[in-house]
């Protein structure tokens, strides 16, 4: 039950996280104009990974896409790549994890296969979350660097009474969404990996063999043998729920859907 809950919760947390990563990637407010020097601006600038926008106090907002690839900073391209990789891995992870969910039966899929799929999706979620966190952090670092650079030469033209104030940018909402979403995806991935350990068949009970001693019958049953493969694809390492001694010719029954509660 705990395994199913952990797996289900991991899936839901990852789903929310990946939705957040997608939202953050699409958001325009990765960087927003710093209003410290001019809190009463009539023009507010903000930028995303794909376009930059200007919101006027009149109520009009004008957005322009970055219609160039070569002209964009390498760091921005790197952030885009990290976010897209994060989304793709997350999406594949979600697809895999749907089939790995314990509460969903797909044909005669064995638990070892589900365990493998759970681990795979968990790792994908972890990498996806790390990609998002890395992407957002790279962008944030870029902002901090540019912020202090523009602060150093805040007033570029001081000829006479004329001032040319450089626009500085600070953290936008998308960064916080990205960090939280990346963290959730990462946590979801870890939960899936933990659930995978619980899903993996850990013990193999050999078929009980009856030894007939003279005079009275004693059933000998060898102790449980720890499976060395953990959650490998060894289908022979199946748990046998035997109520007592069995004969040599008794057929081993595979676990039914009621065997794991």
């Amino acid at each position: 039950m705990a395994v199913t809950a952990c797996q289900g919760l991991g899936f839901v947390v990852s789903l929310i996280g990946i939705a957040g990563i997608i939202a953050a990637t699409c958001m325009d407010q990765w960087s927003t104009q710093d209003l410290y020097n001019n809190p009463v601006t009539a023009v507010f600038n903000y930028q995303g990974l794909w376009r930059s926008c200007v919101r006027e106090s009149s109520g009009f907002t004008e957005c322009r896409g970055y219609f160039t690839l070569l002209g964009l900073p390498a760091m921005l391209q790197a952030v885009r790549a990290l976010m897209i990789v994060g989304i793709v891995l997350g999406a594949i992870g979600l697809l895999v994890s749907i089939f790995a969910l314990k509460c969903i039966r797909i044909g005669s899929m064995e638990d070892s296969a589900k365990a493998n799929m759970t681990l795979t999706s968990g790792i994908m979620f972890i990498v996806s979350g790390l990609c998002a966190i890395a992407g957002v952090s790279v962008f944030a670092n870029m902002l901090v660097t540019n912020f202090w650079m523009s602060t150093a030469n805040m007033y570029t033209g001081m000829g006479g009474m004329v001032q040319t104030v450089q626009t500085r940018y600070t953290f936008g909402a998308a960064l916080f969404v990205g960090w939280v979403a990346g963290g959730l995806t990462l946590i979801g991935g870890v939960m899936m990996c933990i659930a995978c350990r619980g899903l993996a068949p850990e013990e193999t009970n050999y078929k009980a063999v009856s030894y007939h001693a003279s005079g009275h019958s004693v059933a000998y049953k060898p102790g449980g043998f720890k499976a060395s493969t953990g959650f490998g694809s060894n289908t022979k390492n199946k748990k046998i729920y035997d109520g007592g001694a069995r004969t040599e010719d008794e057929v081993q029954s595979y676990p039914s859907k009621h065997d794991y509660v």
Epitope: Q33, N38, V40, T41, A42, V43, N45, Y46, Q47, S52, C53, V54, E56, S57, S58, G59, F60, E62, R64, G157, V162, Q163, T164, V165, Q166, T167
Partner: antibody
């Protein structure tokens, strides 16, 4: 046709109050930021106040801060300027104006004259 | 506050001649986000409210004759009337619409010589 019609002007004593109204027609007021601008007799234009489309952002000129209050009633398609503690230097024609692309004032009312005199 | 200074304060030009009005701001009105200058020009005739001529320093408002043009960037701007007509007699104002308070220039009175 877009129209802005101001009303509520008149003669008032120093220290008195007045409430100006601006009725909009031909467009939906709640899509635009709105301004009040005044012009003293024979003088230039002076911006007075601004209110954003959702009333979330409001600005005032230093000369009227603390005395004037801008507000709007979007369902009624109306803009208001409550003027308290009026002074002789507040005597002017008050215009309401609709903001446009580039923050420009694209449409202006005909204005209403406010005279502050004892 | 951004101070807007217009020159000249009055101008007399012959019909059909070019009229040029200058406007200088104490701070740059160029917005780096969209590379547009937040300066507007208005025309006000006696007894009438002002009329928008130019926004974004050089974009002509619809319905405004093409003899009116705006130019300039940063802190220095110009309104040009290529061929003065009798109906152009008015007071012209430039306005900072980049930062609050939205300040106006003192106005330039244009007359026919």
């Amino acid at each position: 046709e877009v129209q802005l019609v101001e009303s509520g002007g008149g003669l008032v004593q120093p220290g008195g109050s007045l409430r100006l109204s601006c009725a909009a027609s031909g467009f939906t007021l709640n899509n635009f930021g709105m301004h009040w601008v005044r012009q003293a007799p024979g003088k230039g234009l002076e911006w007075v106040s601004y209110i954003s489309s959702g009333s979330g952002t409001i600005y005032y000129a230093d000369s009227v801060k603390g005395r004037f209050t801008i507000s709007r009633d979007n369902p009624k398609n109306s803009l208001y300027l409550q003027m308290n503690s009026l002074r002789a230097e507040d005597t002017a024609v008050y215009y309401c104006a609709r903001a446009y692309y580039g923050n420009a004032f694209s449409f202006w009312g005909q204005g209403t004259l406010v005279t502050v005199s004892s | 506050d951004i101070v807007m200074t217009q020159s000249p304060s009055s101008l007399a030009v012959s019909l059909g001649e070019r009229a040029t009005i200058n406007c200088k701001s104490s701070q740059s009105l160029l917005n780096s986000g969209n590379q547009k200058n937040y300066l507007t020009w208005y025309q006000q005739k006696p007894g009438q409210p002002p009329k928008l001529l130019i926004y974004w320093a050089s974009t002509r408002e619809s319905g405004v004759p093409d003899r009116f043009s705006g130019s300039g960037s940063g802190t220095d701007f110009t309104l040009t009337i290529s061929s003065l007509q009798a109906e152009d007699v008015a007071v012209y104002y430039c306005q900072n619409v980049y930062s609050y308070p939205l300040t106006f220039g003192q106005g330039t009175k244009l007359e026919i010589k």
